[in-house]
Interface confidence: medium
């Protein structure tokens, strides 16, 4: 089913840095490299520096990829719920006449019966069903941190609903902190958006299950509806596995570049664009780390006498289920140029220019 | 350099459910399919279902992958920097003495200059240079939204640090917003975050350029570090072409399903874990539309002599420029499942298994 | 019945090393966070470490962090408490004991404890 | 210095009550952390009494009380009797230390 040959390297790189000149100039919009007749003599303005400059620093802050995914994420990850602790619980005692906040206190032995080792949570989220509401409002998430003093985690702008509706906040850092410390009361505070000089301080959303007005009809109220942590987590004896020796690696340049990966890997390869590509029109940079994509991802035939053997190939050569897995960029950022059109220069962002890693997709 | 041959659809749908078959068993970890011997008879309990349910509704709510990038974003982006009107401007003099907040205006026949259209707007950035501080301080960004009221637009935890350093904010949606509005003066309002229980409401951050206690030096301060906006557009020449017929497509179900494309493509394919895996393990649901990616994706050789004619379909073929574009997933969306192992139902998320849209890469 | 007995514990010279272990029964060994507890002689108690019930997650008291490493393997039910560069400081009784839930930092069993005397 | 601070040592009579406390701060008993006691019989190993502030653990008799408020946790021993002659250790986590967990210094408490 598989038909090998051998990849004639120079080959795949004079493709792909022929595919780079086609891609800058139809990035540009351009039909041919710009005339350079025009172009002042001597260095760059500073002005024109320092705007490439700062374009260059918000590559460096931010990549423009979110990072792969680790290797448990592949795996299936157990949901559960975490009911807050009901509210005839003493601890809501002082918590009962402030009007902008709701509190949601959790017992973290109840998490911990769900998720028994912090690194296997993958998410927690705390979902509050908001009754129907007139009123746009701008509220905050906090959590508990000691005795008297709250941490901010989030916020949000309710707009009027006639219908209840559920709000889901990602709580994952916290409830992982929390399972790295020992069990006991945990809490979030819901609360009104107070500005420096704002007068109304008061919070006009109601939670199902924890707003004060609504206090008497507690017992009708469907536990399903009351304020909860969905988790989701990887099971502990599945968790077993993931250190072991047949674990997915990141096809990233630090792996690649440093190994004899046969497999499907990023490849090193560097444009100069003067020699590479012949040009001149390009001032800054001088050339690039394009990098590229190469090796073989293995379809994988999971017939049931081979099961045990092939599953654990999968997350590595087709965590996609693909019916023809291929090796392609993952994780890929930007690169700023600067260059004429006539006497102006010009800065320009090309967007996924470089191919950080790779994955079989 | 092509060589092209017949796909026979039924062979990859075949091995598309092969796949399937595996990467669900390996996601759970599981050599085989669980015994059913033990499940209990009836209907699954009412708790599962809700918890099953509540795992459908998150991802109803939130797509596991960033939406596929706009035609606009595969060309380059001019990058171009508007100062926040000098600090002696009479705009200033009502918000000299406001102790939580600090002002940046901006005119927006500056930033007209720059981006002349608001759909050009790729993306802006306010820039500020924050001066060394001891303290920790919760800060809040606002918009001017009319005379004298303001609008949320986000927050920062901002930790000691030794050295200047550049805090960047996205304000595309409010500069876009300007551009839609007459020429004028807009502006931000960076604020201490007042909590409704605090005490101390006064902003400790100083920024360069625009703090009340630095006003003395302003004529010293160099340009560079005062307030901007870093904005990245399309330059207007270049956006005359993005309504041409020759613009790239989702390549999603909404196109896809609809079309005869030939090319890459998203294509339909529901899996009945009964009849096509002859599975009855999987109580909820009863399947699930995976889709997969199929069709070519022409590498193109972009010699002198084409240039014109190929480099319109670099965006749609070849954007990432590979050496071999491959037709593969775009944004994918997880799968809860409901299963039974022995007597205990579990109801797990499963990552990456429907297909939404694909891409050449 | 819930056992817990620890063994490994002598006396050894400062710098030295030794292996404490702790042998469980009567529960399922592996769903349960397990801790070590020292007491000097004529003092109270003191926390020394914790072992998560997989063994993913270990922490360690300031006092003892770099140089005593806790392991279990679940297989054999034992615990483990490897420690290198002991000091005068680090002598006293060391006891294994069993979290009441997974992980909740309370201590329901305890072994006997094992001298650990370090001295020149 | 113990970050949970307890009485070096008490007294009581039989038949008396007494009530021991243990002192700490809102990074361990104030943070919601559990609270466990335990009772140490000379020459053996500790043994769990309450848990959770105010549990008792299984085969614990119902003379051992705990209560907690506030950053100050109780535990209190009612119709006191010979064998309850023990050091007496509070225990909970504390979120402001890398170590993790700490125990109060312990209270000797004598039956007279």
């Known amino acids: 089913l598989s038909t090998c040959k051998t990849i004639d390297m120079e080959l795949v790189k004079r493709k792909r840095i022929e595919a780079i000149r086609g891609q800058i100039l139809s990035k540009l919009r351009l039909a041919s490299p710009p005339s350079q007749g025009e172009v002042p003599p001597g260095p760059l303005p500073e002005a024109v520096l320092a705007l490439y400059n700062s374009t260059r620093d918000r590559v460096a802050g931010e990549s423009a990829d979110p990072e792969p995914e680790p290797e448990a994420d592949y795996y299936a990850k157990e949901v559960t719920r975490v009911l807050m602790v009901d509210r005839n619980n003493a601890i809501y005692e002082k918590t009962k006449d402030i009007s902008h906040s709701i509190y949601m206190f959790f017992n973290t032995s109840d998490i911990r019966e769900a998720v028994p080792e912090p690194p296997l949570l993958s998410r927690a989220e705390l979902r509050l069903q908001r009754l129907k509401s007139s009123v746009e409002q701008h509220v905050e998430l906090y959590q508990k941190y000691s005795n008297n003093s709250w941490r901010y985690l989030g916020n949000r702008l309710l707009t009027p609903t006639d219908t209840p509706e559920w709000l889901s906040f990602d709580v994952t850092a916290v409830v992982r902190q929390w399972l790295n410390q020992g069990d006991g009361i945990q809490g979030f505070r819901f609360s009104a958006h107070c500005s420096c000089d704002s007068k109304d301080n008061k919070l006009h959303v109601e939670i199902n299950g924890i707003s004060p007005k609504r206090r008497g009809d507690l017992g009708t109220i469907h536990d399903m509806n009351r304020p909860f942590l969905l988790l989701m987590a990887t099971p502990l004896e599945r968790a077993q596995h993931l250190h072991s020796s047949r674990h997915r690696r990141a096809l990233d340049t630090n792996y690649c570049f440093s190994s004899t990966e046969k497999n499907c890997c990023v490849r090193q390869l560097y444009i100069d664009f003067r020699k590479d590509l012949g040009w001149k029109w390009i001032h800054e940079p001088k050339g690039y780390h394009a990098n590229f994509c190469l090796g073989p991802c293995p379809y994988i035939w999971s017939l049931d006498t081979q099961y045990s053997k092939v599953l654990a190939l999968y997350n590595q050569h087709n965590p996609g289920a693909s019916a023809s897995p291929c090796c392609v960029p993952q994780a890929l950022e930007p690169l700023p140029i600067v260059y004429y059109v006539g006497r102006k220069p010009k800065v320009e962002q090309l967007s996924n220019m470089i191919v950080r890693s790779c994955k079989c997709s | 350099l092509s060589t092209c041959k017949t796909i026979d659809m039924e062979l990859v749908k075949r091995k598309r459910i092969e796949a399937i078959r595996g990467q669900i068993l390996s996601k759970l970890r599981l050599a085989s399919p669980p015994s059913q011997g033990e499940v209990p008879p009836g209907p699954l309990p009412e708790a599962v279902l809700a918890l099953y349910n509540s795992t459908r509704d998150r991802v109803a709510g939130e797509s596991a992958d960033p939406e596929p990038e706009p035609e606009a974003d595969y060309y380059a982006k001019e990058v171009t920097r508007v100062l926040m009107v000098d600090r002696n401007n009479a705009i200033y003099e009502k918000t000299k003495d406001i102790s939580h907040s600090i002002y940046m205006f901006f005119n927006t026949s500056d930033i007209r200059e720059a981006v002349p259209e608001p759909p050009l707007l790729s993306r802006a950035e306010l820039r500020l240079q924050r001066l060394k501080s001891s303290v920790e301080q919760h800060v809040e960004l606002y918009q001017k939204y009319s005379n004298n009221s303001w609008r949320y637009l986000g927050n920062r935890l901002l930790t000691p640090t030794d050295t200047p350093e550049w805090l960047s904010f996205d304000v595309t949606a409010v500069v876009r917003q300007w551009l839609n509005q007459g020429d004028g003066i807009q502006g931000f309002r960076f604020s201490a975050h007042c909590s409704c229980d605090s005490k101390d409401n006064k902003l400790h951050v100083e920024i360069n350029g625009i703090s009340p206690k630095r006003r003395g030096d302003l004529g010293t301060i160099h340009d560079m570090n005062r307030p901007f906006l870093l904005l990245m557009a399309t330059p207007l020449e270049r956006a005359q072409h993005l309504h041409s017929s020759r613009h790239r497509r989702a390549l999603d179900t909404n196109y896809c399903f609809s079309s005869t494309e030939k090319n890459c493509c998203v294509r339909q394919l529901y899996i009945d874990f009964r009849k096509d895996l002859g599975w009855k393990w999987i109580h909820e649901p009863k399947g699930y539309h995976a889709n997969f990616c199929l069709g070519p994706c022409p590498y193109i050789w972009s010699l002198d002599t084409q240039y014109s004619k190929v480099l319109a379909l670099y965006n749609q073929h070849n954007p990432g420029a590979s050496a071999s574009p491959c037709c593969v997933p775009q944004a994918l969306e997880p799968l809860p499942i409901v299963y039974y192992v022995g007597r205990k139902p579990k109801v797990e998320q499963l990552s990456n298994m429907i297909v939404r849209s694909c891409k050449c890469s | 019945e819930v056992q817990l007995v620890e063994s490994g514990g002598g006396l050894v010279q400062p710098g030295g090393s030794l292996r404490l272990s702790c042998a469980a029964s009567g529960f399922t060994f592996s769903n349960y966070g397990v801790h070590w507890v020292r007491q000097a002689p004529g003092k109270g108690l003191e926390w020394v470490s914790h072992?998560?019930?997989?063994?993913?997650?270990?922490y360690y008291a300031d006092a003892v962090k770099g140089r005593f490493t806790m392991s279990r393997d679940n297989g054999k039910n034992t615990l483990y408490l490897q420690m290198n560069g002991l000091k005068s400081e680090d002598t006293a009784v060391y006891y294994c004991?069993?979290?009441?839930?997974?992980?909740?930092?309370?201590?329901?069993?305890w072994g006997q404890g094992t001298q650990v005397t370090v001295s020149s | 210095l113990p970050v949970l601070t307890q009485l070096s040592s008490m007294s009581g009579s039989p038949g008396q009550t007494v009530t021991i406390t243990c002192t700490g701060s809102s990074s361990n008993i104030g943070g919601g952390y559990y609270l466990s006691w335990y009772q140490q019989l000379p020459g053996t190993a500790p043994k769990l009494l309450i848990y959770?502030?105010?549990n008792r653990a299984s085969g614990v008799p119902n003379r051992f009380s705990g209560s907690k408020s506030g950053n100050l946790a109780s535990l209190t021993i009612t119709g006191l009797q010979a064998e309850d002659e023990a050091d007496y250790y509070c225990g909970c986590y504390d979120s402001s230390l890398s170590t993790g967990y700490v125990f109060g210094g312990g209270t000797k408490l004598t039956v007279l």
């Open positions: 004991a069993k979290d009441r839930i997974r992980s909740s930092y309370e201590y329901d069993s």
């Open positions: 072992i998560s019930a997989a063994g993913i997650s270990r």
């Open positions: 959770n502030a105010n």
